[in-house]
């Protein structure tokens, strides 16, 4: 006879899982806010900057009430994957000017990656349907100039900040419904 069966595996409390996701998201939000401020100090932005390849903001604050957990987590994961890809691109192709944002940009990338893994874990713990594998994204074109890289950095960090701010609010609201 094989070894006696172990105790039944208790699924962790989903609220505790969500809590740790909120903490990671809030921490990344503060890091992003600070890094965006650092970028503005080094390379002041002349107005708002956009990048067509970035995801559009998932939700206005007013529409938070209608959110459902599977939709929020799936959308958040997809958006953060896009931002991770953009941060990686920025570090690789952003030019020598943006080297002054290291090691902070590298830390941001690592924390973004960690948050994505946490979201994946949360989705499996909540037995949510796993999204299909991401189709290969077209490669991002290198910035046309050093200033193009700086403008892209403003757009990426600004968009990530808005996305994470939305995510914290959304996750906290969803926690009350679990």
């Amino acid at each position: 006879p094989g070894p006696p069966p172990g105790p039944p595996r208790v699924s962790p409390d989903p609220r505790a899982e969500l809590d740790s996701t909120v903490l990671l998201t809030r921490s990344l939000l503060a890091d992003t806010r600070q890094l965006a401020a650092q970028l503005r100090d080094k390379f002041p932005a002349d107005g708002d900057h956009n990048l067509d390849s970035l995801p559009t903001l998932a939700m206005s604050a007013g529409a938070l009430g209608a959110l459902q957990l599977p939709g929020v987590l799936t959308r958040l994961r997809a958006d953060l994957l896009s931002y991770l890809r953009h941060v990686q691109w920025l570090r690789r192709a952003g030019g020598s000017s943006l080297k002054t944002l290291e090691p902070e940009l590298g830390t941001l990338q690592a924390r973004l990656d960690r948050l994505l893994r946490r979201l994946q874990l949360l989705m499996s713990r909540l037995a949510l349907p796993q999204p299909p594998p991401d189709p290969p994204a077209p490669p991002l074109a290198p910035p046309s100039s050093a200033w193009g890289g700086i403008r892209a950095a403003h757009a990426i960090l600004g968009g990530l900040h808005l996305t994470l701010d939305w995510a914290v609010r959304g996750l906290l609201l969803l926690k009350t419904r679990l």
Epitope: D19, V22, L23, L24, R26, S27, L29, A30, R33, Q34, A36, A37, Q38, R40, D41, K42, P44, L172
Partner: antibody, heavy 120, light 108 residues
Framework: EVQLVESGGGLVQPGGSLRLSCAAS????????MHWVRQAPGKGLEWVAY????????YYADTVKGRFTISRDNAKNSLYLQMNSLRAEDTAVYYC?????????????WGQGTLVTVSS | EIVLTQSPATLSLSPGERATLSCSVS???????LHWYQQKPGQAPRLLIY???NLASGIPARFSGSGSGTDFTLTISSLEPEDFAVYYC?????????FGQGTKLEIK
Amino acid sequence: EVQLVESGGGLVQPGGSLRLSCAASGFTFSSYGMHWVRQAPGKGLEWVAYITPGSNTIYYADTVKGRFTISRDNAKNSLYLQMNSLRAEDTAVYYCAREYYSYDEGFAYWGQGTLVTVSS
Amino acid sequence: EIVLTQSPATLSLSPGERATLSCSVSDLIPSQYLHWYQQKPGQAPRLLIYRTSNLASGIPARFSGSGSGTDFTLTISSLEPEDFAVYYCQQGVDVPFTFGQGTKLEIK
């Protein structure tokens, strides 16, 4: 040794203006974010405003937004708080404070404070 | 905004006793953004503990901090006469940065 010395406080009438200064020494002023924090008589601490080293990002408490302006002159190692449309509830000791080594390590160094009294 | 609530409002203890001060946060915050300050009458506040549990420069080892999520604690293992003061917690994760209302530690 890090030193922060505030000045410019005093008695002002409601609706009036005042400009506070904070002279910094003992550290590379241009490398640190700076804050103003206030304390009404017998009350607790209230954060007022923050400015990044290069002055390109500024945050304010809702209670002072639109009335107070934080600024700095790195060449003069000085931090300022321009206070307009003053109200009785702005009466407080105003402290300038420097972040520790990183933005997320709290307010490590404080001045001795300057008292602002708003009264008719 | 994130609201910090400190308890008790006043704590009356004798020198040599252990003091436990609490700070409850309205929202979950990462522990690296929670700090503690000490203020004596007529003086500016002084940073005691940063990032929940790190002692600031020159702070004696009888002070310690702990906690996570929404509940944080400042502990003074054995009170010295100079420890009687007002203590504030503060969060730095979200703008506006906010302080607790303070706990007054007084001699019994």
